[in-house]
């Protein structure tokens, strides 16, 4: 194949791959017709002048996972056809000025996972056709104004996993075609107003895992095409009322792991495409009426691991498409009987690890499609008559780790549970807490030796096996609830996730912390 170096493999498709620790310099001679060259996992420490001079047809060049620490400015001379250049996973600290001169066709430049300390405007001034620039995983502390001014065609810029402490509001101003901007895992404490104003075509903005405390009110007002906004794991303590008002295309918003104390009504406004909203691990203490009312298509709402002690009856107004609601690991003691009334499509509700002492009998009255209710680890002593009667699709009900009071009043619930044992799962059954003489005994098989008040035990059990639909159900107003359903965390397209199933109050829908990469 026009002379393939012994350390390399060459294919008929003009692809050359050179790998191995024994390689200490660019192998020669390389086939003149090579279009793709990969130099991987070698001990090459430097690139000298023009090592690729005779392979001018090269389109893709990958020099990755080597010991490369020094490159001569003319190393890539004569590669005018090169479209893809990766120098990722090396040991570069400095890029020589003019290194990319003459690479007029270059569209993708990957410099990630090196040790670059700085970049300068002159580095990329010749790369006018560049569409993708990957600089994540370096040691950049600042980006000088003008660094990207010539990259007017750039669509993807990754600056994540660096040491950026601030961003100039002018640094992105000429990137009108940019669709993806990633700044995750830096040390940004605030983003100046106007920083993203020129990014009119931006679709994804990743700001997670920084130290951002405040968001300017108009920070995203020019980003009408934004679809994915990642703000998780920052120090955001409040959201300006208008900060999300101009984001009609948004379909993914992550705010978990911040310091949000409150959410004002309409804060998430109009986002007709938003399907998931992740707000776990904040300090939210209450939910006012209509706080999510603009999110008409929302299907997943995660509010677990906050400090929510009060939910206004109209807090979930507008969420007619919601399927999953996670409220576990909060400080809920009571719930209004109408709080879930609007959630006609709800399938899973997670209320475990709260302080619920009672539940209103009508709490699930309009939520006929519920499939999973997690109420474990609350302070429930009993549940109202008929609370689950109409839930024909209910297949998972978790009631363990509550202080069930096994007196005569528990019989209707006990009888219903007897008939519906499969729904409770096999691992853990609810046990009695009081009276003390039956403590620890299974609620399902408990023998209640007390006379049963006739008012509570009609001839047909109040918790029938076959769901029934009373025309006008009357529910006594008592009891409480808490749940967890397994789901995965927000999957960012460059995120590594592990899912585990746990009952620990530190889990979020059985999810470990997302690690962005």
């Amino acid at each position: 194949y026009h002379g393939c170096p012994s350390e390399c493999t060459c294919s008929r498709a003009s692809q050359v791959e050179c790998t191995g620790a024994r390689i200490v310099a660019v192998p020669t001679p390389l086939p003149w017709n090579a279009m793709s060259l990969q130099i991987l996992n070698t001990h090459i420490t430097e690139l000298n002048e023009s090592p690729f001079l005779n392979i001018s047809a090269l389109i893709a060049l990958r020099i990755e996972k080597n010991e490369l620490s020094r490159i001569t400015p003319g190393a890539f001379r004569n590669l005018g056809s090169l479209r893809y250049l990766s120098l990722a996973n090396n040991k570069l600290q400095v890029l020589p000025i003019g290194l990319f001169q003459g690479l007029d066709s270059l569209e993708s430049l990957l410099l990630s996972s090196n040790q670059l300390l700085q970049i300068q405007p002159a580095h990329f001034s010749q790369c006018s056709n560049l569409k993708e620039l990957q600089l994540h995983g370096n040691h950049l502390e600042y980006i000088p104004d003008g660094a990207f001014d010539h990259l007017v065609g750039l669509t993807k810029l990754n600056l994540g996993k660096n040491s950026l402490t601030h961003i100039s509001p002018r640094v992105f101003q000429h990137l009108g075609n940019l669709q993806v901007l990633r700044l995750y895992e830096n040390r940004l404490t605030d983003i100046p107003m106007g920083t993203f104003d020129g990014l009119v075509n931006l679709q994804e903005l990743a700001l997670q895992q920084n130290q951002i405390g405040l968001l300017s009110p108009g920070l995203f007002h020019n980003n009408h095409n934004l679809q994915r906004l990642y703000l998780s794991n920052n120090h955001i303590s409040q959201l300006p009322p208008s900060v999300f008002m101009q984001l009609p295309q948004l379909n993914r918003l992550t705010l978990f792991g911040n310091s949000l104390k409150e959410l004002s009504p309409g804060i998430f406004g109009p986002m007709p495409n938003l399907r998931e909203l992740w707000l776990y691990d904040n300090h939210i203490s209450s939910l006012p009426d209509n706080v999510f009312s603009n999110l008409r298509q929302l299907q997943v709402l995660i509010l677990s691991r906050n400090q929510i002690s009060f939910i206004s009856p109209g807090a979930f107004n507008g969420l007619t498409e919601l399927r999953e609601l996670s409220l576990h690991t909060n400080a809920l003691q009571d719930l209004d009987g109408n709080v879930f009334r609007m959630l006609a499509n709800l399938q899973n509700i997670s209320l475990q690890n709260n302080r619920l002492r009672q539940l209103p009998g009508n709490i699930f009255a309009n939520v006929n499609g519920l499939m999973a209710i997690q109420l474990q680890n609350n302070q429930l002593e009993n549940l109202p008559l008929g609370i689950f009667d109409h839930l024909g699709k209910l297949c998972e009900l978790r009631l363990y780790d509550n202080p069930w009071r096994c007196d005569s009043d528990i019989l209707p619930l006990r009888n219903w549970l007897l008939l519906n044992q499969p729904r409770l799962g096999t691992d853990t059954v609810p046990v009695c807490f009081s009276p003390a003489n039956v403590r620890g005994q299974s609620l399902i098989i408990i023998n209640v030796n007390v006379a049963v008040p006739s008012v509570h035990v009609p001839e047909v059990p109040s918790y029938p096996e076959t769901p029934w639909y009373p025309d006008t159900p009357s529910y006594p107003d008592t009891t409480s609830v808490s749940s967890t359903t397994e789901l995965t965390s927000p999957v960012e397209d460059y995120t590594d996730l592990t899912t585990i199933q746990v009952t620990d109050d530190r889990s979020v829908w059985g999810m470990t912390q997302a690690q962005s990469g």
Epitope: N353, N377, D401, P403, A436, R439, T503
Partner: antibody
Framework: EVQLVESGGGLVQPGGSLRLSCAVS????????VHWVRQATGKGLEWLGV???????NYNSALMSRLTISKENAKSSVYLQMNSLRAGDTAMYYC??????????????WGQGTTVTVSS | DIVMTQSPDSLAVSLGERATINCKSS????????????LAWYQQKPGQSPKLLIY???TRESGVPDRFSGSGSGTDFTLTISSLQAEDVAVYYC????????FGGGTKVEIK
């Protein structure tokens, strides 16, 4: 007879971790919850967390990131794992349960405690 | 978190006299629907583990002498030892379980 016996205390280096055990007898861990409480010398009581009969856990929010409570029902043992120890974690560590009391978070049976000293 | 503040820090009372310990919570411990205050009192004698005396603010644990009584509601609570005995020398702690438990700082009761 109901008994709770703590073990695993001793001298730990700052930054290290500890794993304390609470061996229970006279009752089943599938029926009763077990709490962990600590007390620095001459100081007050501090609730650390609880593992309930079904395995759910609750933790003191100030310590939650460093604590894990687990159990092995068959071995009648409850464990407290604590990481990133500092001098302020030096204390007597107790496990306790709610055997007779009507108070769900009441602790009416206690172990004798095990001493943990964090020092270099 | 709910903060529990006890007063006084220490108390010296003659044998047979009344001892009164106060406990104040940073928020109400009353669950109005259950009509219960989620407050308990513990006694810890020197070198011993704590002992539960009173729960739900005023319900004595079985076996606890009736000279011990609890009162109060909402945020203000009191433990009273109507006639102090020598064996009552101890540190007394209040504990809330309205939210996840927190203890007061303790009150040391001694004989005058």
């Amino acid at each position: 007879e109901v008994q709770l016996v703590e073990s695993g205390g001793g001298l730990v280096q700052p930054g290290g971790s500890l794993r304390l055990s609470c061996a229970v007898s006279g009752f089943s861990l599938t029926s009763y919850g077990v709490h962990w409480v600590r007390q620095a010398t001459g100081k007050g009581l501090e609730w650390l967390g609880v593992i309930w009969a079904g395995g759910s856990t609750n933790y003191n929010s100030a310590l939650m990131s460093r604590l894990t409570i687990s159990k092995e029902n068959a071995k009648s043992s409850v464990y407290l794992q604590m990481n990133s120890l500092r001098a302020g974690d030096t204390a007597m560590y107790y496990c306790a349960t709610h055997m007779i009391t009507e108070d769900y978070y009441g602790m009416d049976y206690w172990g004798q405690g095990t001493t943990v000293t964090v020092s270099s | 978190d709910i903060v529990m503040t006890q007063s006084p820090d220490s108390l010296a009372v003659s044998l047979g006299e009344r001892a009164t310990i106060n406990c104040k919570s940073s928020q109400s411990l009353l669950n109005s629907r259950h009509r219960k205050n989620y407050l308990a009192w513990y006694q810890q004698k020197p070198g011993q583990s704590p002992k539960l005396l009173i729960y739900w603010a005023s319900t004595r644990e079985s076996g606890v002498p009736d000279r011990f009584s609890g009162s109060g509601s909402g945020t203000d609570f009191t433990l009273t030892i109507s006639s102090l005995q020598a064996e009552d020398v101890a540190v007394y702690y209040c504990k809330q379980s309205y939210n996840l438990p927190t203890f007061g700082g303790g009150t040391k009761v001694e004989i005058k």
